[in-house]
């Protein structure tokens, strides 16, 4: 009886269970009553990452420098090339097909998480007791200066964008 289902790493064609081609190889000829499946290695700059019956290998991804991309990991016959972004840029999607500049956190906001090649800067508002007076992709919110530890008093209250201003203690009682 011809099979209706095949084992793992096989496929059914013309009532025959044929071996799939291993990762890194493409199908040249299906198996027959007389022959095993014929497979050939993928060429330079090509890959197949699964057991397959593909007659063409996939092209490695091109990391286009004009889009701010560079190679993070070179592709093999079994894996695609992995792109990442140049310093100061991050991917616009999981597939990393293009890059955008890391965003800066405005005054009043600090960096919660520094950007990577694949994720943008995450900003957070400076809470009470902290401030940021610059637009930056690296600076966290800084704590207000503690006037007391310098034996000074607060002359001007701090905000989320400015530090406190300390001054000498008023000696007149």
């Amino acid at each position: 009886e011809p099979p209706t289902a095949c084992r793992e790493k096989q496929y059914l064609i013309n009532s025959q269970c044929c071996s799939l081609c291993q990762p890194g190889q493409k199908l040249v000829s299906d198996c027959t009553e007389f022959t095993e499946t014929e497979c050939l290695p993928c060429g330079e700059s090509e890959f197949l990452d699964t057991w397959n019956r593909e007659t063409h290998c996939h092209q490695h991804k091109y990391c286009d420098p004009n889009l701010g991309l560079r190679v993070q990991q070179k592709g093999t016959s079994e894996t695609d090339t992995i792109c990442t972004c140049e310093e100061g840029w991050h991917c616009t999607s999981e597939a990393c097909e293009s890059c955008v500049l890391h965003r800066s956190c405005s005054p009043g906001f600090g960096v919660k998480q520094i950007a990577t090649g694949v994720s943008d800067t995450i900003c957070e508002p400076c809470p009470v007791g902290f401030f940021s007076n610059v637009s930056s992709a690296f600076e966290k919110c800084h704590p207000w200066t503690s006037c007391e530890t310098k034996d000074l008093v607060v002359q001007q209250a701090g905000t989320n964008k400015t530090d406190v201003v300390c001054g000498p203690q008023d000696r007149l009682r």
Partner: antibody, heavy 115, light 112 residues
Framework: QVQLVQSGAEVKKPGASVKLSCKAS????????IYWVKQAPGQGLEWIGG????????NFNEKFKSRATLTVDTSISTAYMELSRLRSEDTAVYYC????????WGQGTTLTVSS | DVVMTQSPLSLPVTLGQPASISCRSS???????????LHWYQQRPGQSPNHLIY???NRFSGVPDRFSGSGSGTDFTLKISRVEAEDVGVYFC?????????FGGGTKVEIK
């Protein structure tokens, strides 16, 4: 239905060349190898080699490799075998055959090599 | 090359009686994929070969069930349970496990 139709009988002189054809119909030509088999008068069968019409890849019996050339013309679903530097021992019936989902043979081409 | 040896060379048979043909290979025909690529076919006088059995024991579509194949490794047999007049011809075994593919010398089946 699948059919393999071979070219007509040939008579050649020793040292000459001959090109036999095998026209396929009734299936997708590039999906299956075409093989060639020799049967000398009153003799058994000898496998010459095969060609994959998808990419032109060939495999051969070493005995025939230096004198047999296998080609295809996918636009007319035809396979060819050219045999060069003919000698009297090449006198035989030559079959083309295809397998995969059944086995199919051409009707054979008779080649006579005689001075 | 793998040598395929068939016996007998000639097999006179009586209609309705069984017949058996042996085929031995000079090396094992078990492929690394687990299949054994040993095949049988018939050639009637003046005709192209006609395949009967593939991979030792699988009948091609349309082949009568009086034909059966068996064996493993290097030793194989084709049996005809009850010979009919149309079974006259030469029977060949062949192997496609090893390149070059090779054929047995043939067994001529004739009616007594």
């Amino acid at each position: 239905q699948v059919q393999l139709v071979q070219s007509g009988a040939e008579v050649k002189k020793p040292g000459a060349s001959v090109k036999l054809s095998c026209k396929a119909s009734g299936y997708t030509f590039i999906s299956y190898y075409i093989y060639w088999v020799k049967q000398a008068p009153g003799q058994g069968l000898e496998w010459i080699g095969g060609i994959n019409p998808r990419n032109g890849g060939t495999n051969f019996n070493e005995k025939f490799k230096s004198r047999a050339t296998l080609t295809v013309d996918t636009s007319i679903s035809t396979a060819y075998m050219e045999l060069s530097r003919l000698r009297s021992e090449d006198t035989a019936v030559y079959y083309c055959t295809r397998h995969g989902n059944g086995v199919y043979w051409g009707q054979g081409t008779t080649l006579t090599v005689s001075s | 090359d793998v040598v395929m040896t068939q016996s007998p060379l000639s097999l006179p048979v009586t209609l309705g009686q069984p017949a058996s043909i042996s085929c031995r290979s000079s090396q094992s025909l078990l492929h690394s994929n687990g299949n054994t690529y040993l095949h049988w076919y018939q050639q009637r006088p003046g005709q192209s070969p006609n395949h009967l059995i593939y991979q030792v024991s699988n009948r091609f579509s349309g082949v009568p069930d009086r034909f059966s194949g068996s064996g493993s490794g290097t030793d194989f047999t084709l049996k005809i349970s009850r010979v009919e007049a149309e079974d006259v011809g030469v029977y060949f075994c062949s192997q496609t496990t090893h390149v070059p593919w090779t054929f047995g010398g043939g067994t001529k089946v004739e009616i007594k």
